[in-house]
Amino acid sequence: DSSKWVFEHPETLYAWEGACVWIPCTYRALDGDLESFILFHNPEYNKNTSKFDGTRLYESTKDGKVPSEQKRVQFLGDKNKNCTLSIHPVHLNDSGQLGLRMESKTEKWMERIHLNVSERPFPPHIQLPPEIQESQEVTLTCLLNFSCYGYPIQLQWLLEGVPMRQAAVTSTSLTIKSVFTRSELKFSPQWSHHGKIVTCQLQDADGKFLSNDTVQLNVKHTPKLEIKVTPSDAIVREGDSVTMTCEVSSSNPEYTTVSWLKDGTSLKKQNTFTLNLREVTKDQSGKYCCQVSNDVGPGRSEEVFLQVQYAPEPSTVQILHSPAVEGSQVEFLCMSLANPLPTNYTWYHNGKEMQGRTEEKVHIPKILPWHAGTYSCVAENILGTGQRGPGAELDVQYPPKKVTTVIQNPMPIREGDTVTLSCNYNSSNPSVTRYEWKPHGAWEEPSLGVLKIQNVGWDNTTIACAACNSWCSWASPVALNVQYAPRDVRVRKIKPLSEIHSGNSVSLQCDFSSSHPKEVQFFWEKNGRLLGKESQLNFDSISPEDAGSYSCWVNNSIGQTASKAWTLEVLYAPRRLRVSMSPGDQVMEGKSATLTCESDANPPVSHYTWFDWNNQSLPYHSQKLRLEPVKVQHSGAYWCQGTNSVGKGRSPLSTLTVYYSPETIGRR
């Protein structure tokens, strides 16, 4: 059942005498493995024997034996899929039909493959695109219907017999679908390649020529032109004549139209290959070319630069840059149309010739205000001298000059005064538009350039102003020299360093931070009473009576300043102790008597001790000693002692008399 056999392979294979042939082949025998394979050359079916007759090129049997003469032909397949064959070398008489006789356990099949072997290597085939245009990349393809693993070949490209520089890409195919060798060359033809011969050469592995194919390139291109001019240097003077001729060196396809262009613009009514210019003017100077068109497009000749020479035209001056900043650099450029270019220039500043300036450009490296003014020039060439143009104005800008800060007030200035200052300057370009003042303050500017400081501060030392246009120029600071009363007056205790005790030597100093003028007087005051006029107040031996609130005053010609009140505290042991008795020093028995220990002390008494007439201390430690009820035996002299952190003090004796009551006297 033939439907069970499926084969795939190229229909025809090509080779030449002495080469080889490789036949890629696949098959499928669905009913089992291949048991027998015979390769026939031109097989013919014999109906009598029901077998194929013909030359057996290859035979494989169940026992696997292969006749020795079959080495030229190799079956590279297997028992179920691959039926690839190789014949090496292949001979001319191998041409014809190859028959693959396949037998499996139950089925048989004859598959036919055509083999075309030529006497000599056959040529490859060059394939070109339908149209080739100059500078457009094309791919040239060289195809050979041959490839065999045992016989390496190469394809080489030649242009007019010379190997082409471009790299070709060679590919081979040995598949069941196709067998070929292909070379592809990417190439950008130029117009000069038109009509040239391209060859694809087949070579063996050693580079030996086998065969080739050639084609002639048909490169479509715009017309290629040459321009000729009389006179040949294209330099003329006004009034001369000029002839230009256009020649076509190549065109594919043929040209159709001719035109002439000047500076890229078409000249009207000039459609012949010759351009005649009579009595030229300077306006006709420029770049000329001819343009010829064909179906591909227009082609242009090289440009001819026609120079019509003339004397310089009236000149103009260009300034880089105006306005110019003082100190910057400025360049003046004399611009005058002339041919040939001017060789000499004369420069003028405010109408006066500038000596030694003969160049097209004048460079001033450091501009000063006096450089301002009108600049003009005259240009000269071999044909004559031009006229002086209108000139250009140089404006030199600079910051305000000689700025000064001026105090308008009579001197000296006192703290609290209103001070008026003005900001003056000598010259400025552009004009002064604003003023600045240093330091900044909440001050008024009643008019431009005038500063009014109301209630001037003691510490307003210096003021500087700036006059500003595009830049600010600062004046040197001016000293206000504000006079003021002494500041930050304070009382300083110089000695002792610790607490003041009664009897200490005490020095107080009147100190202050600053005064202007510096000449000062001092005054000391206690509780509104003047004490002295020195900077220091000294107590050789301080007493409690010296305690109190002290102030010092410092005077100068502007005014006087007082310190904060300073409290002088004197510490002393209890003094002026005395015992006072209530209701009196004579008390009737049975009543109540209160003895009080009165004293003067700083700090206050912290501890009291009571003593009787025998100097016996009593068990009482408060300021008051209360006797209730008082007895006649309480009569006697009492004294007290007070103690504080500084020391002790004692009172004199005070006598308490307790007399009998009428009842007691009545009982006696």
Epitope: D488, R490, V491, R492, K493, D511, S513, S535, K564, T567
Partner: antibody, heavy 118, light 112 residues
Framework: QVQLVQSGAEVKKPGASVKVSCKAS????????MHWVRQAPGQGLEWMGI????????SYAQKFQGRVTMTRDTSTSTVYMELSSLRSEDTAVYYC????????????WGQGTLVTVS | EIVLTQSPLSLPVTPGEPASISCRSS???????????LDWYLQKPGQSPQLLIF???NRAPGVPDRFSGSGSGTDFTLNISRVEAEDVGVYYC?????????FGQGTKVEIK
């Protein structure tokens, strides 16, 4: 010994007022000027003002003018600092400090009072 | 008001090594009698400031003699001859010449 003891920490809302006290002991209260200094978290020291406990006269830093009031009570040897219209940037430790009568230096400082405004 | 500028703002120190802090005033703190009304304070972590030096160069009672103050007019220096671990904290200068009293920004001294 000489010491200044301040009132405890306070938490206030923005716009409220706070009154911090500073009680002096161990010296004659009326003989020394008292200053107030504050310190915001992680910041330096900032002087607020001075009071003379003897007469009650005051001087305030320009920044706090109109918001701060310093008073004293001689009977209890205490000075007070009241700050009104509180804002979050018033969060700080507030210190009272005694001025040495000889040098003008702050020789004794209170332990500080933390005022938090949030 | 008088502006005081301290430098450096941070000072890493090695125990036993000397250290110094500068304080510059926007105007002279020298008085008529020649006193420089500049004081130095130390604020240890979590504590109130404490007086170290008063009137430019006088050590406050109880302050170790490794601390000293110098300078006059507008430039003042606090010197620590040999830094000890307990000296860490923020050091402030303050002018006591006039009201308002003003302080420097503070210099943080820490052990390396």
């Amino acid at each position: 010994q000489v010491q200044l003891v301040q009132s405890g920490a306070e938490v206030k809302k923005p716009g409220a007022s706070v009154k911090v006290s500073c009680k002096a002991s161990g010296y004659t209260f009326t003989s020394y000027y008292m200053h107030w200094v504050r310190q915001a978290p992680g910041q330096g020291l900032e002087w607020m003002g001075i009071i003379n406990p003897s007469g009650g006269s005051t001087s305030y830093a320009q920044k706090f003018q109109g918001r701060v009031t310093m008073t004293r009570d001689t009977s209890t040897s205490t000075v007070y600092m009241e700050l009104s219209s509180l804002r979050s940037e018033d969060t700080a430790v507030y210190y009272c400090a005694r001025e040495d009568s000889g040098s003008g230096a702050f020789d004794i400082w209170g332990q500080g009072t933390l005022v938090t405004v949030s | 008001e008088i502006v005081l500028t301290q430098s450096p703002l941070s000072l890493p120190v090695t125990p036993g090594e000397p250290a110094s802090i500068s304080c510059r005033s926007s105007r002279s703190l020298l008085s008529y009698h020649g006193y420089n009304y500049l004081d130095w304070y130390l604020q240890k972590p979590g504590q109130s400031p404490q007086l170290l030096i008063f009137v430019g160069s006088n050590r406050a009672p109880g302050v170790p003699d490794r601390f000293s103050g110098s300078g006059s007019g507008t430039d003042f220096t606090l010197n620590i001859s040999r830094v000890e671990a307990e000296d860490v904290g923020v050091y402030y200068c303050m002018q006591s010449l006039q009201t308002p009293r003003t302080f420097g920004q503070g210099t943080k001294v820490e052990i390396k």
